[in-house]
């Protein structure tokens, strides 16, 4: 359906709040450099612009798509060179061109200060004195650092901010009434990044056909009631979405997640009967629940998949006929009978389906050459199974701090080169599984815990994308996405490293260390670990863990002292000494 | 949708030859191993002979082993079948069907009668 002005049309449908909310979302996460104030005055200016154009749609440049409006202010910024370098170079170029070229300078670890939160008083007075700006600015300096995040949901997420405010800042306890929800906010936002971070990268990086497979496994999953050509619909509707979210198009993407959660709720009876509560929320809440809503019970006796894709003789008249559907077809059928696989298995199983039909549909006695290809999907089913199985009860035995100590060891062994800090980051990421997925019952681990992985090693690979070091991370990251995870499994110790020269200055610590807080300290110890692995990559985890509980030791000992610095720079010394001499430095 | 096309059918006497052809569309008929199938009145559909897709591999059912031969030609997407020393038993419809699948074509009549 043309409009005349694409502005005014979603002026109109998203309303003016929104609108404001998702162009300051895609002004920032374009420009991640440039200041707050900077950001909402060329919001204001679009906005009085839009205002124009739905009082007439005819007014001058209304007729211009939403690119060229947004990219020709954008361009006006004044420090554009200064501040980004060849990014300025955009804007000599058309659209779509100059679109592509502010995509490709998106940063994914942007050089920008930690968020500090403020005492709760100040942030209480500030909501108070301008509660707009204050919510503006949440908006503002998460979108910056995550220039990925699904907006439509960031309007979520500064709902529930702003509903906490509101009812904390009159609470007796403030702090208690507000710290544990902006910590859940804080913990739920990184999560929520990180997964809208895989699905853009599965776009951009394999194409809209490997979303789409992605997505029927997991649609399937949740709606196992639903028809094929439903959950067909539903792919198709979902992969422009996230399409236009992932390409910056933030007004199309909230706009269309609007028409399918109107779409599901109006048809839930041929999808699911868990969306009655998800449909009774006003918009945003609808929209994250839906998202989020478990999955449906599968119907009772579905037939054997051997019959349709095994047995027929049809088999490759039906591969023929529509490739991708036929696939779509096995994808659907193969996903809503297994809740309890990861949608990351699915995929493999299908991939694994389509290479032996390609391979048999050719032979003169394709059946003979097929008959045994669900044979071939028990190893590629067992491997997560016991990968999982042994992790948990690794998991179990260590704790979550001393798991991820374990995978630190193991993956700065897999790739050294990789900087400290992702290292750390990733690793306490992984770890992370422990308490996220080993807590399930069997059927629901696998899921849990493979999913959640491909997140996080997503950020691996969107990390070292920005300065590659180690090819084995490009290899892995690149060669298949749904085989990363067994990828990354699968590397040993990389011999061709040669250990980092020994720095004192990388293992001297200072009192500071005493007034972090507990998970801070924690990364401190775990980027020393990295460090020695760096320095000494064939340690055993004897000699690791002897060193480690040294420093725990030392660092207890010195914050307990009098005179913490001198402790640490005495004991410190001592400490060096030792490990040097217990890893044979 | 697959489109197959059969040809080539006719009356032929005991002993004559006849030549088939299939035209394949809608389909990438190169990677896709092939089949002839006959159904004669009154009974079951019987599979006749099979290609691979590169045409290193042809079956034959024992029927017609030595009288007919597969081939086909991946540039036109054509499957061929050559019949020779025909029998009034050879008498069916014949079809092209993908893999050893079941017919959706119209396939040819073959009448071999004196």
């Known amino acids: 359906d043309a409009h005349k002005s694409e502005v005014a049309h979603r002026f109109k449908d998203l309303g003016e709040e929104n609108f404001k909310a998702l162009v300051l979302i895609a002004f920032a996460q374009y420009l991640q450099q440039c200041p707050f104030e900077d950001h909402v005055k060329l919001v204001n200016e679009v906005t009085e612009f839009a205002k124009t154009c739905v009082a007439d749609e005819s007014a001058e440049n209304c007729d211009k798509s939403l690119h060229t409006l947004f990219g020709d202010k954008l361009c006006t910024v004044a420090t554009l060179r200064e501040t980004y370098g060849e990014m300025a170079d955009c804007c000599a170029k058309q659209e779509p061109e100059r679109n592509e070229c502010f995509l490709q300078h998106k940063d994914d670890n942007p050089n920008l200060p930690r968020l500090v939160r403020p005492e709760v008083d100040v942030m209480c007075t500030a909501f108070h004195d301008n509660e707009e700006t204050f919510l503006k600015k949440y908006l503002y300096e998460i979108a910056r650092r995550h220039p990925y995040f699904y907006a439509p949901e960031l309007l979520f997420f500064a709902k529930r901010y702003k509903a906490a405010f509101t009812e904390c800042c009159q609470a007796a306890d403030k702090a208690a009434c507000l710290l544990p929800k902006l910590d859940e906010l804080r913990d739920e936002g990184k999560a929520s990044s990180a997964k809208q971070r895989l699905k853009c990268a599965s776009l951009q990086k394999f194409g809209e056909r490997a979303f789409k497979a992605w997505a029927v496994a997991r649609l399937s999953q949740r709606f196992p009631k639903a028809e094929f050509a439903e959950v067909s619909k539903l792919v198709t509707d979902l992969t422009k979405v996230h399409t236009e979210c992932c390409h910056g198009d933030l007004l199309e993407c909230a706009d269309d997640r609007a028409d399918l959660a109107k779409y599901i709720c109006e048809n839930q009876d041929s999808i699911s009967s868990k969306l009655k509560e998800c449909c009774e929320k006003p918009l945003l809440e609808k929209s994250h629940c839906i998202a989020e809503v478990e999955n449906d019970e599968m119907p009772a006796d579905l037939p054997s998949l051997a019959a349709d894709f095994v047995e027929s003789k049809d088999v490759c008249k039906n591969y023929a006929e529509a490739k991708d559907v036929f696939l779509g077809m096995f994808l659907y059928e193969y996903a809503r009978r297994h809740p309890d696989y990861s949608v990351v298995l699915l995929l493999r199983l299908a991939k694994t389906y389509e290479t032996t039909l390609e391979k048999c549909c050719a032979a003169a006695d394709p059946h003979e050459c097929y008959a045994k290809v669900f044979d071939e999907f028990k190893p590629l089913v067992e491997e997560p199974q016991n990968l999982i199985k042994q992790n948990c009860e690794l998991f179990e035995q260590l704790g979550e701090y001393k798991f991820q100590n374990a995978l630190l060891v193991r993956y700065t062994k897999k790739v050294p080169q990789v900087s400290t800090p992702t290292l750390v980051e990733v690793s306490r990421n992984l770890g992370k599984v422990g308490s996220k997925c080993c807590k399930h019952p069997e059927a629901k681990r696998m899921p849990c815990a493979e999913d959640y992985l491909s997140v996080v090693l997503n950020q691996l690979c969107v990390l070292h994308e920005k300065t590659p070091v180690s090819d084995r991370v490009t290899k892995c990251c690149t060669e298949s996405l749904v085989n990363r995870r067994p990828c990354f499994s699968a590397l040993e110790v990389d011999e061709t490293y040669v250990p980092k020269e020994f720095n004192a200055e990388t293992f001297t610590f200072h009192a500071d260390i005493c007034t972090l807080s507990e998970k801070e300290r924690q990364i401190k110890k775990q980027t020393a670990l990295v460090e020695l692995v760096k320095h000494k990559p064939k340690a055993t985890k004897e000699q690791l863990k002897a060193v480690m509980d040294d420093f725990a030791a030392f660092v207890e000992k010195c914050c307990k002292a009098d005179d913490k610095e001198t402790c640490f720079a005495e004991e410190g010394k001592k400490l060096v000494a030792a490990s040097q001499a217990a890893l044979g430095l | 949708a697959v489109q197959l096309v059969e040809s080539g059918g006719g009356l032929v006497q005991p002993g004559g030859s006849l030549r088939l052809t299939c035209t394949a569309s809608q389909f990438t008929f190169r990677s896709f191993g092939m089949s002839w199938v006959r159904q004669a009145p009154g009974k079951d559909q019987e599979w006749v002979s099979a290609i691979s897709a590169d045409s290193s591999t042809k079956n034959y059912a024992d029927s017609v082993k030595g009288r007919f031969t597969i081939s086909r030609d991946n540039a036109k997407k054509m499957l061929y079948l050559e019949m020779n020393s025909l029998k009034p038993e050879d008498t069916a419809v014949y079809y092209c069907?993908?893999?050893?699948?079941?017919?959706s074509s119209p396939g040819t009549q073959v009448t071999v009668s004196s």
């Open positions: 069907v993908i893999g050893r699948g079941s017919p």
